[in-house]
Interface confidence: medium
């Protein structure tokens, strides 16, 4: 799986979309998990409704919401009030039995609020980022990870 980068502005909302084949994944619940280290497990953040037919209902866990358009084949995750610690590698997953298929690997980048003059030195940029021109709520820029670009910062 290629990694898609989604960029959001600190303090605002970021929407991540994960398209999938609605026929292939028919009847399956979905989940959003955070990758713990490059080879570590993916820790569940939030999953769609326990009853698959109600997957369109938005479910929240803290500041993260998930909703699934099962007919159109799009899983949408909303990260509200984006913070620097939200930056990192995530996965959209399709659940079947005790297993999970990766629908998309997502790298979330948190950009400094251009209207906030506080020091942005603690904001993490895993690689060369595209400029963020539109700071509208629920808006994001996404791109595929560049070849050779590392989704995790080097560990000392």
């Amino acid at each position: 799986h290629n990694t898609t980068v989604f960029q959001g502005v600190a303090g605002q909302s970021l929407q991540v979309s994960c398209p999938y084949d609605s026929m292939k994944h028919w009847g399956r619940r979905k989940a959003w998990c955070r990758q713990l280290g490059e080879k570590g497990p993916c820790q569940r953040v939030v999953s769609t409704h326990n009853l698959w037919l109600l997957s369109f209902l938005r479910r929240w866990n803290g500041s993260t919401a998930i909703t699934d358009d099962t007919l159109g084949g799009t899983l949408t995750i909303t990260l509200r009030n984006l913070q620097p610690h939200d930056a990192g590698l995530y996965q959209c997953q399709s659940l079947h039995g005790s297993e999970a298929d990766t629908l998309r690997k997502v790298l979330v980048e948190v950009l400094a609020d251009p209207l906030d003059h506080r020091d942005a030195g603690d904001l993490w940029f895993p690689g060369e980022s595209e400029s963020f021109e539109d700071a509208h709520v629920e808006h994001s820029i996404s791109r595929s990870l560049l070849e050779g670009e590392i989704p995790f910062p080097p560990t000392s």
């Epitope: 084949d21 026929m23 292939k24 028919w26 009847g27 399956r28 619940r29 326990n50 009853l51 698959w52 037919l53 659940l95 079947h96 039995g97 005790s98 297993e99």
Partner: antibody
């Protein structure tokens, strides 16, 4: 109507490979999982693996991992099962079977089966 | 892998009488979407298997209403209310909740 037509019987030598085909018609081939199940003489049913023709995604039973390859050709709506390093215990009838979908939810049951292909492994 | 165990392995029934086959799984067959993917197949002599019941209790199209399925979790039952001559063959329970899909050993139904 849905039809799955399999290739004819094969006689193979131990150590060789066999490739069985399954031509599908009457439904959207690309968007339904296709399974392969085998049945040794006088024995029960054994699931080998499956493929989703739309993107080539496959799952195999551990027992056959490394020896079986399931492929699909969307242009001809045909699924293939190739089994290598054949041994006498692989003598069996091999079936392709489509996974049924019903709403709401996936039933994930095999509703249509091919007629079966007898593969005999003998020296 | 999920192990499916059927009982009895063979059954001899007088036409018109009921028959019952039990199937037990080694772990729960409730999927993450809350459906239970337990199915029943019949393989008549010299034929390919055919689907009878899907998702525990749903009769497949064309299957007579004398066939019924029930159960939950790990214990399931197939019942034939009145056995007919055409019902002879081997009955298999199968799960598709978890990959790899697995089948029971089969129950052979004969007519007395």
């Amino acid at each position: 109507q849905v039809q799955l037509v399999q290739s004819g019987a094969e006689v193979k030598k131990p150590g060789s490979s066999v490739k069985v085909s399954c031509k599908a018609s009457g439904y959207a081939f690309s968007s339904s999982w296709m399974n392969w199940v085998r049945q040794a003489p006088g024995q029960g049913l054994e699931w080998m693996g499956r493929i989703y023709p739309g993107d080539g995604d496959t799952n195999y039973a551990q027992k056959f991992q490394g020896r079986v390859t399931i492929t699909a050709d969307e242009s001809t709506s045909t699924a293939y099962m190739e089994l290598s390093s054949l041994r006498s215990e692989d003598t069996a009838v091999y079936y392709c079977a489509r996974l049924l979908r019903n709403q709401p939810g996936e039933s994930y049951a095999m509703d249509y089966w091919g007629q079966g292909t007898l593969v005999t492994v003998s020296s | 892998d999920v192990v499916m165990t059927q009982t009895p392995l063979s059954l001899s029934v007088t036409p018109g009488q009921p028959a019952s086959i039990s199937c037990r799984s080694s772990q729960s067959l409730v999927h993450s979407n809350w459906y239970t993917y337990l199915h029943w197949y019949l393989q008549k002599p010299g034929q390919s298997p055919q689907l009878l019941i899907y998702k525990v209790s749903n009769r497949f199209s064309g299957v007579p209403d004398r066939f019924s399925g029930s159960g939950s979790g790990t214990d399931f039952t197939l019942k034939i209310s009145r056995v007919e001559a055409e019902d002879v063959g081997v009955y298999y329970c199968s799960q598709s909740t978890r990959v790899p899909y697995t089948f029971g050993q089969g129950t052979k139904l004969e007519i007395k």
